[in-house]
C-alpha cells in the first residue's frame, strides 16, 4: 500500500514566490515617463518574472517633513490619478500579480515616520488602510519602523485591519535593523506579518557565517513563515560583491519564506553606477537607451533587452530560479534542513512528502572545492542519494539536466548548484 | 591542444622591473582563471598570484605584495606579470597556469616557463 | 620552510608499489580544501597527475592513485616504472594565508 499523503499547509499567495518592490515609479519606468498608466505597460514584464506581488510606492502626497501637508488617501498627481491607480489594479489582477501599497508617511523627507507627531500619523495611516483596503489592494508595507515609537503595538493594530478585512491580505514592515532580538520582538506581536530587515547583509558573506545567520533566524522565529532580503528597501549590488550575486539569487529563491527583490536586482542594478544618478533609486536599465545623457554609458549586457536574449545572464538565471520557487512544491512549503560540507559552503534540501526533492549547494568562496557533503546530518526523511540532476549552476559551463555524482561534486569559485531528485519510499 | 607560452624573462638588476606576458590558446581564455608560479634553481614550486576570469578578483602571496602585479587582456587571450622592485630571491622559472574547471581549483595546464635572473 | 610536508625522496624497484605522504594543518587540507599532485620530470614544466583528492585526468595511468584523510593526504604509484622517475608536489590552499600551498617535493627514484 502506497504511504498516505502529507496533508499540504494553507498557502497565501505570498508563499508562492517573489515580491518585486517599485519603491520609485519615475526610476523604474526611465527618465520622465514615471507614472502608473506606464506602469500598465510594464504589466507583461513583471509576469515574465513570475512574480507574485508588487509592492509599490509610496504614491501619496506629502510636502517633505510636513503632516499637514501628507495625505495618504490622495495620490500624488506626478504619480496619475487614482482612476490610474484602479485601472492598474485591474490590470494586474488579470494577470495574477497582487499590489501592496507602500504607505511610508513622510518618505520624501528626514524622518518617515514625523517623530514629534506619531499619534496623529497612526490615525492617518488606520484610515489609509481601510480606503485602500475598500479600493482593492491586497496589502501595504511600511518602513523605517524601528523609527516608530510603540511600533509592536501599532502594528498589532494595522495587522487587525488588514486581516479583517481579509485573511488574504498581506502586511509587510521594514527595518533598517539587523539585530536578531529586535527583528524577533516585532514579529512576536504580529502572527502573519512579514518583515524586511537588513538582518543577511550583517555578513562576512561566507558559507559558514550564512548558514549560522539562516539558521538562527530560523530557530528564532519557530514556525512562522519568513521572508528574505538583504534590506528593506535598498538593491542586491549595493550589500554583496558582484561575484556572489547569482549565490544570492539562488539562496533568496530556495530558503524557506518569501523572497523580497528591488526592482534592478534581477539584472544587477547597480545604485548610482551612473552618473547622475541618485543612489537610492537609479534608473532601470530596460535598453541602451535608458540612459541618453552619456551615450555609450550603458552596454547591451546591462539591460533587460540584452539579458533577456542571453541564456547565461542574471536575469535568465531569476526567472528560471522564479518559475521552480512558484510550482514545486519542496520549495513552495518544503521542510528544509542544512547539512555540513566543504569550507566556505553552506548547503541544504528542500524536501515536501513524496515529491521531488531540491539540494542546494552553495560555494560563497574563490576556491573551487570537493562539496564533502556529509549525509549524517540529515535525518531519515531526508537522507541524499548518490546521484542527482542538475536543475541549474549559477555558472555557465555545466548541462543542465545531466545527473552529477554527489560524492564527487565538485562546485567552482562563488559557484551555486541546484539539483533535483526523487523520493524514494 | 591547451598552450601557454611565456616570454618578457631575462636578466634584470636588484630593485629593477620586468614584466613577463602568457599568450594563451586552444581554449577559451576569457573563462578561466589563471595563476602564476614560480620555481628557483634546484627548489620547489612556489604559488605567487591568481586573477578571476575577468580580472576583478586577484590575490598574490605576501612574498610578492605590493612589489608584482598580475592583469589579463581577454581580448588579446594573454596574461601578464609586473614585477618591480625585483630582489635576488626573485631568480627563479615563472610558470603561467590554468586553474581548471570542475577539479577543485588544481592547476591543469602550465607553460613552458620564463627564467626571471636577478643579479648585479 | 614549505607549508605542506613531503618526504624529500623516495625510492622503489620497478614493479614495486611507493607511497608519498603529503601533510598539512586544519587550515588547509584539514580544513576540507582539496588536494592535488603534480609530476615534474626532469627539466620539464609540472603536469597535473591527481586532483581533487583522488581524480585523475584523462590519459593518467590508473597505476597513480591518491586520497586524502584528516589533515593529510597520500599519492600511491603502483607497478613502478622507469619513466616515473620524477618529483612529485602536493598542492592545497590555505585559509590562513588565503593563498595556494606547495609541498617542498619529493624525488622519486626508481632502482
Known amino acids: 500500500r502506497a504511504p498516505r499523503c502529507r496533508e499540504l499547509p494553507a498557502q497565501k499567495w505570498w508563499h508562492t514566490g517573489a515580491l518585486y518592490r517599485i519603491g520609485d515609479l519615475q526610476a523604474f519606468q526611465g527618465h520622465g515617463s514615471g507614472n502608473l498608466a506606464g506602469l500598465k505597460g510594464r504589466l507583461d514584464y513583471l509576469s515574465s518574472l513570475k512574480v507574485k506581488g508588487l509592492v509599490l510606492g509610496p504614491l501619496h502626497k506629502n510636502q517633505k517633513d510636513d503632516v499637514a501637508q501628507t495625505d495618504l488617501l490622495q495620490i500624488d498627481p506626478n504619480f496619475g490619478s487614482k482612476e490610474d491607480f484602479d485601472n492598474l489594479l485591474q490590470s494586474a489582477k488579470k494577470k495574477s500579480i497582487r499590489v501592496i501599497l507602500d504607505l511610508t508617511p513622510n518618505y520624501r523627507g528626514e524622518n518617515l515616520w514625523f517623530s514629534t507627531q506619531v499619534d496623529s500619523v497612526a490615525t492617518k495611516v488606520k484610515d489609509a488602510l481601510e480606503f485602500w483596503l475598500q479600493a482593492g489592494v491586497d496589502g501595504f508595507q511600511v518602513r523605517d519602523i524601528e523609527n516608530l515609537k510603540d511600533a509592536s503595538s501599532f502594528l498589532a493594530e494595522w495587522e487587525n485591519i488588514t486581516k479583517g478585512f481579509s485573511e488574504d491580505r498581506l502586511l509587510i514592515a521594514g527595518t533598517n535593523s539587523s539585530d536578531l532580538q529586535q527583528i524577533v520582538s516585532l514579529l512576536e506581536s504580529n502572527k502573519d506579518l512579514l518583515l524586511t530587515s537588513s538582518y543577511l547583509s550583517d555578513s562576512s558573506f561566507t558559507g559558514e557565517h550564512t548558514k549560522s545567520l539562516v539558521t538562527q533566524y530560523l530557530n528564532a522565529t519557530g514556525n512562522r513563515w519568513c521572508s528574505w532580503s538583504l534590506s528593506q528597501a535598498g538593491l542586491l549590488t549595493s550589500f554583496l560583491p558582484a561575484q556572489l550575486l547569482r549565490l544570492y539569487q539562488l539562496m533568496l529563491f530556495t530558503l524557506p519564506g518569501t523572497p523580497v527583490f528591488s526592482y534592478g536586482d534581477e539584472i544587477g542594478l547597480k545604485a548610482a553606477a551612473l552618473p547622475g544618478q541618485p543612489v537610492e533609486a537609479p534608473v532601470m536599465l530596460w535598453d541602451e537607451s535608458s540612459f541618453p545623457d552619456i551615450p555609450g554609458a550603458v552596454s547591451a549586457n546591462m539591460t533587460v533587452k540584452g539579458q533577456s536574449e542571453d541564456p547565461g545572464s542574471l536575469l535568465s538565471l531569476f526567472r528560471q530560479l522564479s518559475d521552480q520557487r512558484s510550482k514545486e512544491r519542496s520549495l513552495l512549503h518544503g521542510d528544509f534542513h542544512t547539512f555540513s560540507s566543504g569550507p566556505g559552503l553552506f548547503s541544504y534540501i528542500r524536501h515536501w512528502d513524496q515529491n521531488e526533492r531540491f539540494l542546494v549547494v552553495l560555494n560563497f568562496g574563490d576556491v573551487g572545492l570537493s562539496a564533502g557533503l556529509q549525509a549524517s546530518d540529515l535525518p531519515a526523511s531526508a537522507s541524499l542519494p548518490t546521484k542527482a540532476d542538475l536543475v541549474l549552476s549559477t555558472q555557465p559551463g555545466r548541462e543542465e539536466g545531466s545527473p552529477l555524482e554527489l560524492e564527487r561534486l565538485k562546485l567552482e569559485p562563488h559557484e551555486g548548484l541546484l539539483l533535483r531528485f526523487p523520493y524514494v519510499a | 591542444e591547451v598552450q601557454l607560452v611565456e616570454s618578457g624573462g631575462g636578466l634584470v638588476q636588484p630593485g629593477g622591473s620586468l614584466r613577463l606576458s602568457c599568450v594563451a590558446s586552444?581554449?577559451?581564455?576569457?573563462?578561466?582563471?589563471m595563476h602564476w608560479v614560480r620555481q628557483a634553481p634546484g627548489k620547489g614550486l612556489v604559488w605567487v598570484s591568481r586573477?578571476?576570469?575577468?580580472?576583478?578578483?586577484?590575490r598574490y602571496a605576501d612574498s610578492v605584495k605590493g612589489r608584482f602585479t598580475i592583469s589579463r587582456d581577454n581580448a588579446k587571450n594573454t596574461l601578464y606579470l609586473q614585477m618591480n622592485s625585483l630582489r635576488a630571491e626573485d631568480t627563479a622559472v615563472y610558470y603561467c597556469?590554468?586553474?581548471?574547471?570542475?577539479?577543485?581549483?588544481?592547476?591543469?595546464?602550465w607553460g613552458q616557463g620564463a627564467l626571471v635572473t636577478v643579479s648585479s | 620552510q614549505s607549508v605542506l610536508t613531503q618526504p624529500p625522496s623516495v625510492s622503489g624497484a620497478p614493479g614495486q608499489r611507493v607511497a608519498i605522504s603529503c601533510t598539512g594543518n586544519n587550515s588547509n587540507i584539514g580544513a576540507g580544501y582539496d588536494v592535488h599532485w603534480y609530476q615534474q620530470l626532469p627539466g620539464t614544466a609540472p603536469q597535473l597527475l591527481i586532483y581533487g583528492n583522488s581524480d585523475r585526468p584523462s590519459g593518467v595511468p590508473d597505476r597513480f592513485s591518491g586520497s586524502k584523510s584528516g589533515t593529510s593526504a597520500s599519492l600511491a604509484i603502483t607497478g613502478l616504472q622507469a619513466e616515473d622517475e620524477a618529483a612529485y608536489y602536493c598542492q592545497s590552499y590555505d585559509s590562513s594565508l588565503t593563498g595556494w600551498v606547495f609541498g617542498g617535493g619529493t624525488k622519486l627514484t626508481v632502482l
Open positions: 597556469v590554468r586553474e581548471g574547471r570542475y577539479t577543485g581549483s588544481s592547476l591543469d595546464y
Open positions: 586573477i578571476n576570469s575577468d580580472g576583478s578578483i586577484i
Open positions: 586552444g581554449f577559451t581564455f576569457s573563462s578561466y582563471w
